[in-house]
Interface confidence: low
């Protein structure tokens, strides 16, 4: 069940979906994959206080532990809960491929 | 594809499953969980330092991005990959149910 | 060529639903999300939501939460957008419109469909 | 939600006018910013993505600029075919808002 989507810290700072302009050579993919030259990268970023955007029981009992126990307990952190799928046009031995990647650009964020 | 299970910050130190006794009070569940009246909550804790644990390509995505910009994109996130059923004997108005939660019990653990 | 063709006006009694259809051809359906915006007359346009066809994950617009759903028949490469518990203020053209890669600019649109609310 | 402030909402201007319209969010959109022109009872047209790609196919006349919260679209020499409302539209956060629109016509 997702919880709460209202951010107590403002506008914009709490897990949300954000944009990541990058190279192939910011990824690290310059040498395997010919296209696209950049990639757009959807991935979850902020904070997660309370019970914001919760995925699951165990992210509502990690909201209580940390605020009992902040040190040894971590809050919840901002993750994918689904990803959109993306092609990329790879090098091969014998010329190039495209490669569907389902796990590689997040689609929704959810706490956990 | 789970990456590199080695850990280079020492021993203990990078994301894996720890266990953390809490109370129905600590969870704030005394007033509608009547068994057990401590659980033994696994969760997964610890640091997702380059590769380690990378759940799928869209962590590795964020480890090189953090690595480029730390200020803007946060380091992978220690998160359950996977999760251990626990019944719950809870309070009801007729009496009491037992209840089964399957996303309460972290019971492995990757980067993310 | 991409195109995205949906289906013919409606008219709607305040409280009925609507149901949009949007039909993809020239690419693969899958490989890119599809987004809805409207368009009340003389007015500036407004998203609704997007669909993942791959997977079915929807992000809404909160406005539109509860009263727009969005599907997709993967099969007849068609997406749609229904909207429920119309009252006279939906009145407006409905786009459907198809995402950029890997950023939710929208590259092709529908021709849209006018969705008029009156008792 | 992110709010996005055009201006002005209507102008008037020449064929040949250099023609300037100006986006403003109400916080950081990391370059995340698209352009389109529409045309009355036509889908609006992707003109620009990036805040400065200019899709394939878009005359160079047009361009954009900007960063941060402030971004600028420009005409550089309006043609008589260049008619129509123009809006910005930010993807940096859903749900994706689109500013209120610039109507420009010819004097």
């Known amino acids: 069940a997702r919880n709460g989507d209202h951010c107590p810290l403002g506008p914009g700072r709490c897990c949300r979906l954000h944009t990541v302009r990058a190279s192939l050579e910011d990824l690290g993919w310059a040498d395997w994959v010919l296209s696209p030259r950049e990639v757009q990268v959807t991935m979850c970023i902020g904070a997660c206080p309370s019970q914001f955007r919760a995925a699951n029981m165990h992210a509502q009992i990690k909201t209580s532990l940390h605020r009992l126990k902040p040190d040894t307990v971590p809050a919840p952190c901002c993750v994918p809960a689904s990803y959109n799928p993306m092609v990329l046009i790879q090098k091969t031995d014998t010329g190039v491929s495209l490669q569907t990647y389902d796990d590689l650009l997040a689609k929704d964020c959810h706490c956990i | 594809a789970r990456n590199g299970d080695h850990c280079p910050l020492g021993p203990g130190r990078c994301c894996r499953l720890h266990t953390v006794r809490a109370s129905l009070e600590d969870l704030g569940w005394a007033d509608w969980v009547l068994s057990p009246r401590e659980v033994q909550v696994t969760m997964c804790i610890g640091a997702c330092p380059s590769q380690f644990r990378a759940a799928n390509m869209h962590a590795q995505i964020k480890t090189s991005l953090h690595r480029l910009k730390p200020d803007t994109v946060p380091a992978p996130c220690c998160v359950p990959a996977s999760y251990n059923p626990m019944v719950l004997i809870q309070k009801t108005d007729t009496g009491v149910s037992l209840q089964t939660y399957d996303d309460l019990l972290a019971k492995d653990c990757h980067c993310i | 060529e991409v195109q995205l063709v949906q289906s013919g006006a409606e008219v709607k009694k305040p409280g009925a639903s609507v149901k949009v259809s949007c039909k993809a051809s020239?690419?693969?359906?899958?490989?890119?999300?599809l987004n809805w915006v409207r368009q009340a007359t003389g007015q500036g346009l407004e998203w609704i939501g997007d669909l993942n066809p791959y997977n079915q994950g929807i992000i809404y617009n909160q406005k539109f939460k509860g009263r727009a759903t969005l599907t997709v028949n993967k099969s007849i490469s068609t997406a749609y957008m229904e909207l429920s518990s119309l009252r006279s203020e939906d009145t407006a053209v409905y786009y459907c419109?198809?995402?950029?890669?890997?950023?939710?600019?929208?590259?092709?649109w529908g021709q849209g469909t006018l969705v008029t609310v009156s008792s | 939600d992110i709010q996005m402030t055009q201006s002005p909402s209507s102008l008037s201007a020449s064929v040949g006018d250099r023609v300037t319209i100006t986006c403003k969010a109400s916080e950081d959109i990391y370059h995340r910013l698209a352009w389109y022109q529409q045309k009355p009872g036509k889908a609006p047209k992707l003109l620009i993505s990036g805040a400065t790609s200019l899709e394939t196919g878009i005359p160079s006349r047009f361009s954009g600029s900007g960063s941060g919260t402030d971004y600028t679209f420009t005409i550089s020499s309006l043609q008589p075919e260049d008619i129509a409302t123009y809006y910005c539209q930010q993807y940096w956060s859903p749900p994706f808002t689109f500013g209120g629109g610039t109507k420009v016509e010819i004097k």
């Open positions: 419109a198809r995402e950029g890669r890997g950023g939710a600019w929208f590259d092709s």
């Open positions: 020239g690419y693969t359906l899958t490989d890119y999300n």
